[in-house]
Every structure is written in structure tokens, then in C-alpha cells.
């Protein structure tokens, strides 16, 4: 059939909860392409009916929820004007009850379910939740050894759990939990994460570089919506946190009640030698009190700010 085969690494997943996999393979999927999902070399495509437990949602295959019998090799076929690629994804489903210690250890989990905290540093864990836009995720709760995490050293920020002054006691088994809503139905997502610790700096003490902003002011009209990106380059296995603060407080905490100013979800692009991270700040409505206040982007020890400024009056 003239399609080039590409084999992705195995994904190991937990039964009885939602799972989604996006068929993206840059640069193949960057142009005008059609994507079709199949299971186990079947000639019949995966359903696109949103009521189906397993269905294709744009470029994604979505399981609501995943079941033990869903293990197998799935193919997505990406057809462009002059090209065809078939991507093979091996999904292995296992039954795991995170808090049942009588059940043996986990299988060889994907790397995102194994994370490392750096002793004595401020660090973070990430809850990897990859779902299409049709899935709405609620706030994330974090657990350690099956107990909900509380305490002033821990802060939940979007999909991350910030851990300040990491200690040896922070190692162990964690889980992040969110409620996913799709077509009016709710599902629980629970990701287990094994967390180990190290004293190694890992990234050699490198300092992240904030590309933008550059400690400058931005002219913006009162009442408008404003989104500002903070772009940071850093080494691949850095442990630096990236966030927006005002008055030395995380913006999501500072505007906790009104939610008028929020930090966006961090994204990153991976290059050979470094990563480029983007985390934005959204002003739903700029108010007078926002002017003249430094909004700080933090990335490890690096900081840069923007100051909102009223546009100069136009006397023309």
C-alpha cells in the first residue's frame, strides 16, 4: 500500500480509566494530512462516533475508559498529498490498584510515570494528562502513599506539584487524580508516579535563559484581555520551575478568588541540546490596579518582568 512504517515505543497503561493517544509525528503532521486509526491491522477504521467507548477524535484515539482487553497494536495512517506513513503503537493494559500493596510491583512503566526530585532544591512533579480538546479536566489532586498531599511545602500549579526544599522523605509512590468530563459523562483519571531522589545537580548548575519578556513595559488599554508568553530555554534534564509571580506570590494564588489573572499550562519544544519552554499569563480584563506592577516570570534563578502601562493619549 506504499505506506512507510514507523514503530513507536510501547505504552503501558492502567485499566478502567480514560486514555488517549495523539497521532502526531512532526514534520509529517504539520501540513494538510488525513489521519485514520486502526486496531491490530484491521481494515475497518476505529469509529468516529463520540458515543463509542473507543473512538477517533480528530487525530487522537480515545478510550473511555480503557479496558483490559484493549491491549494490542494500534496503527494510525497519516496520508498527505504525496506521502503515507503508518505509525504503530503497542498498548499494554494492566490491572493496577494503586493502594493495594498486596499486588506486586508495577510493570516497567513509561518514563513519565518515573520522576526524580532533587534533594535540597525546589522541584516539581508533573501529572501527564494527554487528552483531546473534547475532554475537560478538573482540578488535580495529588496523593503520596494513598494519602492526599497537604502541607506548606507543596503547591499544586496546573498539572504540576511544586515541592519546596525536597527531602529524602519525599521519595516514594505518588498519584495524581483528575476528573475528566466528555459528552456529559465523568471519568476518573489516576496516574501513579514512582518518585526517586538524587543529590546530583543533573543539569550542571546551568542557568535558564529567559528569551522573553525582557524587563520592559507593555502598553495596554484598560479593560482589554492580554496574554503574555514567557519563553525560556534550558537544558534537557533541568529541574527548574517556570512560573509567573506578582508581589512574590504565584499569580494563581494571588488572584485565587477572582481568577482574573491566570497562569497558562506550560508547553515545551524539544531541540537537540535544549528545550524551549513557554508559560503564559492571561489577564482576562486589565484593571487600573494592574498598571505599574511588575509581573515576574521566574525560571529557576532567572527572572524577567513586564509592567503594564496605559497607552499615551492620542491628541490627533
Amino acid at each position: 500500500d506504499g505506506c512507510k512504517d514507523i514503530f513507536m515505543k510501547n505504552e503501558i497503561l492502567s485499566a478502567s480509566q480514560p486514555f488517549a493517544f495523539n497521532c502526531t509525528f512532526p514534520p509529517i503532521t504539520s501540513g494538510e494530512v488525513s489521519v485514520t486509526w486502526y486496531k491490530n491491522s484491521s481494515k475497518i477504521p476505529v469509529s468516529k462516533i463520540i458515543q463509542s467507548r473507543i473512538h477517533q477524535d480528530e487525530t487522537w484515539i480515545l478510550f473511555l475508559p480503557m479496558e483490559w482487553g484493549d491491549s494490542g497494536v494500534y496503527q494510525c495512517v497519516i496520508k498527505g498529498r504525496d506521502s503515507c506513513h503508518r505509525i504503530h503503537v503497542n498498548l499494554t493494559v494492566f490491572e493496577k490498584h494503586w493502594c493495594d500493596t498486596s499486588i506486586g510491583g508495577l510493570p516497567n512503566l513509561s518514563d513519565e510515570y518515573k520522576q526524580i526530585l532533587h534533594l535540597g532544591k525546589d522541584d516539581s512533579l508533573t501529572c501527564h494528562l494527554h487528552f483531546p480538546k473534547s475532554c475537560v479536566l478538573g482540578p488535580i489532586k495529588w496523593y503520596k502513599d494513598c494519602n492526599e498531599i497537604k502541607g506548606e511545602r507543596f503547591t499544586v500549579l496546573e498539572t504540576r506539584l511544586l515541592v519546596s526544599n525536597v527531602s529524602a522523605e519525599d521519595r516514594g509512590n505518588y498519584a495524581c487524580q483528575a476528573i475528566l468530563t466528555h459528552s456529559g459523562k465523568q471519568y476518573e483519571v489516576l496516574n501513579g508516579i514512582t518518585v526517586s531522589i538524587t543529590e546530583r545537580a543533573g543539569y550542571g548548575g546551568s542557568v535558564p535563559k529567559i528569551i522573553y519578556p525582557k524587563n520592559h513595559s507593555i502598553e495596554v488599554q484598560l479593560g482589554t484581555t492580554l496574554i503574555v508568553d514567557c519563553n525560556v530555554t534550558d537544558t534537557k534534564d533541568n529541574t527548574n520551575l517556570r512560573c509567573w509571580r506578582v508581589n512574590n506570590t504565584l499569580v494563581d494564588d494571588y488572584y485565587d478568588e477572582s481568577k482574573r489573572i491566570r497562569e497558562g499550562v506550560e508547553t515545551h519544544v524539544s531541540f537537540r541540546e535544549h528545550n524551549l519552554y513557554t508559560v503564559n499569563i492571561t489577564f482576562l480584563e486589565v484593571k487600573m490596579e494592574d498598571y505599574g506592577l511588575p509581573f515576574m516570570c521566574h525560571a529557576g534563578v532567572s527572572t524577567a518582568y513586564i509592567i503594564l502601562q496605559l497607552p499615551a493619549p492620542d491628541f490627533r
Epitope: 516497567n108 526524580i116 521519595r171 518518585v195 526517586s196 538524587t198 546530583r200 543533573g202 543539569y203 534537557k236
Partner: antibody
Framework: QVQLQESGPGLVKPSQTLSLTCTVS??????GYWNWIRNHPGKGLEYI?????????YYNPSLKSRVTISRDTSKNQFSLKLSSVTAADTAVYYC??????????????WGQGTLVTVSS | DIQMTQSPSSLSASVGDRVTITCRAS?????MYWYQQKPGKAPKLWIY???NLASGVPSRFSGSGSGTSYTLTISSLQPEDFATYYC?????????FGQGTKLEIK
């Protein structure tokens, strides 16, 4: 059970490059830290360096100009190259990894070691 | 670099003796790791995070210390304990080992 196995020539000529490979089973080298350590005859242990889960490498500054650690994730192997060797590089070379009790720095799993002699 | 100095360098002792090996760091370290090595064998993790015994290590071994001074203690020496012991730190690179303490039968 994690197992590590060193392989490579046991004899290297002075000024040449020492090359060793560590083959890993029971764990993926895309998690954790993968270390090289050597033991000079009748002397102590010397830390050479590591390659991390992301491919980041760290080298002991005393060897940095001569050492390269790399990996092949498809074969689940990582390698050591030490250039311009002299008799002082004669040692038993070990690969090792940690992760014991969720502590990456606790080197619990070791290869059996391979003796490399530098001699003409 | 943090220099790790073990004392004594060698020690002759008898079965049943209480033995203490000291590791002094030239600067503060957060945790100490100890390894046991027997001739012709790879080192074995013995004590991690200063005071935790690795799997299979007898309870007669203990580890303690903080800052620049750390100790490995054997409460009652047994024949299988005769070996060389190394301390190691990861607080500051390079990740240095002590020169080793060789424990011999008197």
C-alpha cells in the same frame, strides 16, 4: 532484576582509546542515572561520570578532557570512551546504577567489572 | 573538590570486636553512602542516606553522622565482615569516594 554487563578489550596500547560498553537488562536507560567507576589496582574507587535518563552527561573534571559517555537506547546500552590512555588508566572498570529504595545515588546494581590493562 | 578522608586506612580486629570507621569530608555534605568491597568482586551498596542499611546488610552495622563527620560502626565483628569499606558523597561534584578502610583479621 536489574543486571549490568561490561564488555570491551582487556588490553589497550598507550595513547590509544579505551572503549567499554555496558549492556543493561531489567531496566530502561531512559530512567535514572548510569555510571562508570574504576578501581585502580591496590588503590581506591574513582568516579568517572554518568549519563542521565535524558542523555545529559557528567564527567569527573580530572578526566573530562579525555572521557566520553554515550548511549544507544535501542540496544539499552551505554558506553565509555577514554582517550590518550597511559599506564595510570590501568584499572577494573565498573558500570553501575542506583534507584535502590527510590534513591538514585545509592549504587545498588553493579556490573562484575572488567580489567583493562594499558600496555604496549 | 570535597576531599573524603577515611580513618583508619587499615584496621586489624578480632571477631566480636566493636569497630568504627570514620569518614571526614573537607566541606559539609548532606548524606553519606558506604560500600563494601571484597577482593575480585564489585563493590556492594552497604549504607545509604547516612544511616539506612541496604538489603541483606546485617543489623550489627549502623551509620551515623552529619556535616563533615560520618561513621560506620560494626557492633560485633563477624568473619564475613572483613573487607574494604568506602564512603562516598554526592552533595558536590565531583562525586568523591574515600580512599577506603581495609578491615583485616587480627
Amino acid at each position: 532484576q536489574v543486571q549490568l554487563q561490561e564488555s570491551g578489550p582487556g588490553l589497550v596500547k598507550p595513547s590509544q582509546t579505551l572503549s567499554l560498553t555496558c549492556t543493561v537488562s531489567g531496566a530502561s536507560i531512559t530512567s535514572g542515572y548510569w555510571n562508570w567507576i574504576r578501581n585502580h589496582p591496590g588503590k581506591g574507587l574513582e568516579y568517572i561520570g554518568y549519563i542521565s535518563y535524558s542523555g545529559y552527561t557528567y564527567y569527573n573534571p580530572s578526566l573530562k578532557s579525555r572521557v566520553t559517555i554515550s548511549r544507544d537506547t535501542s540496544k539499552n546500552q551505554f558506553s565509555l570512551k577514554l582517550s590518550s590512555v597511559t599506564a595510570a588508566d590501568t584499572a577494573v572498570y565498573y558500570c553501575a546504577t542506583g534507584g535502590y529504595d527510590y534513591v538514585e545515588d545509592a549504587l545498588y546494581y553493579w556490573g562484575q567489572g572488567t580489567l583493562v590493562t594499558v600496555s604496549s | 573538590d570535597i576531599q573524603m578522608t577515611q580513618s583508619p586506612s587499615s584496621l586489624s580486629a578480632s571477631v566480636g570486636d566493636r569497630v568504627t570507621i570514620t569518614c571526614r569530608a573537607s566541606s559539609n555534605v548532606r548524606y553519606m553512602y558506604w560500600y563494601q568491597q571484597k577482593p575480585g568482586k564489585a563493590p556492594k551498596l552497604w549504607i545509604y542516606l547516612t544511616s539506612n542499611l541496604a538489603s541483606g546488610v546485617p543489623s550489627r552495622f549502623s551509620g551515623s553522622g552529619s556535616g563533615t563527620s560520618y561513621t560506620l560502626t560494626i557492633s560485633s565483628l563477624q568473619p564475613e565482615d572483613f573487607a574494604t569499606y568506602y564512603c562516598q558523597q554526592y552533595t558536590t561534584s565531583p562525586y568523591t569516594f574515600g580512599q577506603g578502610t581495609k578491615l583485616e583479621i587480627k
